[in-house]
Interface confidence: low
Amino acid sequence: SAPFSFLSNVKYNFMRIIKYEFILNDALNQSIIRANDQYLTAAALHNLDEAVKFDMGAYKSSKDDAKITVILRISKTQLYVTAQDEDQPVLLKEMPEIPKTITGSETNLLFFWETHGTKNYFTSVAHPNLFIATKQDYWVCLAGGPPSITDFQILENQA
């Protein structure tokens, strides 16, 4: 059945970029890297320069959701992390600019960002029970939990 957010009329308006050029490391200290033009994967890196750098943009919900809603973009590109279905890899979708308004099926571009101490979770707005996750010998995907790893540490330049 269609996710709840597809059926609702919730509109998300772009607010601002809130983080630039950060790295996501999973609980095994693996960094997210580019697997190819379309997919991401995770690997233990000696040189963090090889890790994907992300920018995070914040959106505000028309129903003033208590959760902060974000879009993830690969820094210095026009590639945005896009959710598919459970256990499917997240895709890198190219768009000419950051969407000013997102609603309906386009909510697959959005994630609820939650923090618990140093752990960061990104839940799909389109699939609210699924998280961005890493999985052994697989792409970065959407998953509901173990054996996939759903918590990430954000590593930033301390500007």
């Epitope: 601002r16 970029i17 943009g57 902060i68 500007a159």
Partner: antibody, heavy 122, light 107 residues
């Protein structure tokens, strides 16, 4: 109506600390970072740093690192700035200022508190 | 740190005059340039952000332009209530420095 209301004027001795509060209302506090800016008498504006009101992480300008701390009480939508080891040159008006909503200039400040005068004198 | 050089430091003009203030950054700031107005004893107010975008509610006689390192702030027809000090600020690189200000007075 969006408002940032700061605590009252303070007079401190050199070496002491001061803590200034900034209570926000009229918007969702955690969606907008909070800056702290100071202005010495007859001088320009000096940005001390910023706190991410969602995560609580802070960024401090080099000139203030080690002496300033930004904190939050999200339950009351209040930001705090504490400056320690005060000296006479810290005499200034201290402002809190909210990050702008709009894309493109992430470090513009669209709403400001009324300012808190801190006087450091022996 | 990026240095912001504002000129002139003070300016006297008549009501109705076109007033221009310039701000030069020590390096390219990619249009991340903001202009504030501060009246005596008051907090600064944002007028223009991202070099040329007018904050909603700000009168259209205020405008901004520029790119790279050189930026201009213009009041097309000076009004008595525009008497204030004007500051530029770069929002490109921490610590997001301000110009030293331009004090605007009425002749």
């Amino acid at each position: 109506e969006i408002q940032l209301v700061q605590s009252g004027a303070e007079v401190k001795k050199p070496g002491a600390s001061v803590k200034v509060s900034c209570k926000a209302s009229g918007y969702t506090f955690k969606y907008y970072g909070m800056n702290w800016v100071r202005q010495a008498p007859g001088q320009g504006l000096e940005r001390m740093g910023w706190i991410n009101t969602y995560t609580g992480e802070s960024r401090y300008a080099d000139d203030f690192k080690g002496r300033v701390t930004f904190t939050l009480d999200t339950s009351t939508s209040t930001a705090y700035m504490e400056l320690s080891s005060l000296r006479s040159e810290d005499t200034a008006v201290y402002y809190c200022a909210r990050d702008i909503y709009y894309f493109g200039s992430d470090y513009a400040m669209d709403y400001w508190g009324q300012g808190t005068t801190v006087t450091v004198s022996s | 740190d990026i240095q912001m050089t504002q000129s002139p430091s003070s300016l006297s003009a008549s009501v109705g005059d076109r007033v221009t203030i310039t701000c030069r950054a020590s390096q390219d700031i990619s249009n991340r340039l903001n202009w504030y107005q501060q009246k005596p004893g008051k907090a600064p107010k944002l007028l223009i952000y991202y070099a040329s975008r007018l904050k909603p509610g700000v009168p259209s006689r205020f405008s901004g332009s520029g790119s790279g390192t050189d930026y201009t702030f213009t009041i097309s027809s000076l009004q008595p209530e525009d008497i204030a000090t004007y500051f530029c600020q770069q929002g490109n690189t921490p610590p997001y420095t301000f110009g030293q200000g331009t004090k605007l007075e009425i002749k």
